[in-house]
């Protein structure tokens, strides 16, 4: 009897949906795998007789529940199917946004770029899928533990009146208030402010 694939899970980030699994121990030889998805009550092959332990389901509709299954095969034998249900719009992980930071005197000017979606138009981003899309920004003085959070209203934000000649670090994530679903933080960007622009009287 052929054992089923183990640890079957969907690794989905920004709607790049990769079904992954692990090959079970099997003494007779190398296993192959077939992965399918349910479409109009019929299972359709997505990856057939593959030696890989993953299958790309990024073409699935973003909405609704999808039933996926995978089994192991050897010669004319096969394992039972292992099923999971996956809802991309709920289950996908929101990857880190892009961020551009520019120093102007004692201010940091930031522009945010929503993560792009795989297999879509070049301009299509996570912001197009989620109506409530917003950003969380956190910043701190480099070398200190205290972090400050703000929620910009737009795709840009300015941190003003910062201490001159001080290095500040900033990171951003996507956030969906209606779902309380937070994305992954971007890597911190650290920049040093310059002089205070205020003119002495």
């Amino acid at each position: 009897m052929v054992p089923p694939p183990e640890n079957v899970r969907m690794n989905s980030v920004n709607f790049k949906n990769i079904l992954q699994w692990e090959s079970p121990a099997f003494a007779k030889g190398n296993l192959t795998f077939t992965a399918q998805y349910l479409s109009y009550r019929i299972f359709q092959d997505k990856c057939m007789n593959t030696t890989l332990t993953e299958c790309d389901f990024s073409s699935l509709s973003k909405y609704g529940d999808h039933t996926l299954r995978v089994r192991a095969e050897f010669a004319d034998e096969h394992s039972d199917w292992v099923n999971i249900t996956f809802c991309p719009v709920d289950d996908t992980i929101i990857g880190p946004p892009g961020m551009q930071v520019e120093v102007l005197a004692d201010s940091l000017h930031m522009r945010f770029l929503a993560p792009k979606i795989e297999n879509e138009y070049e301009t299509w981003t996570m912001k197009n899928v989620y109506n409530s899309w917003t950003y969380n920004v956190q910043y701190w003085k480099n070398g200190t533990d205290e972090k400050f959070q703000i929620t910009p209203q737009y795709d840009f934000e300015v941190l003003r009146n910062l201490e001159p000649w001080t290095t500040y670090c900033v990171q951003v994530r996507g956030f969906l208030p209606d779902r309380n679903k937070a994305g992954e933080w971007s890597e911190p960007v650290c920049e040093q402010t310059t002089h205070d622009e205020t003119v002495p009287s």
């Epitope: 996956f86 289950d91 779902r179």
Partner: nanobody
Amino acid sequence: QVQLQESGGGSVQTGGSLRLSCAASQVNMNSVGWFRQAPGKAREGVATISPSGGATYYTDSVKGRFTISRDNAKNTVYLQMNSLNAEDTAMYYCAADGGRDWWLLRPQTFSYWGQGTQVTVSS
């Protein structure tokens, strides 16, 4: 900020059942896990569930006995525990937002934690 509150713990005889609940203070469409910690032992993963509830993972010792589920309309995740035995005695915690590795049952991947509910199984 997500706040989690566990309930449903208590004392039960060997072979008995309990249903734990984990209520989020606001809607939380992220992965959720149940973990437990017995006195003098490390915190270990028990079960996790995906945001939509369509995928679940269990540690080997509870497979076939415990069932994790969620009701997103009620912002609540449940752990139904059957055929309990003395080894299940522990403080049970729920945790939310397991990131990319939520299915691995590792405490360090989860961002938000409840205060815990005690489960005691006696013969």
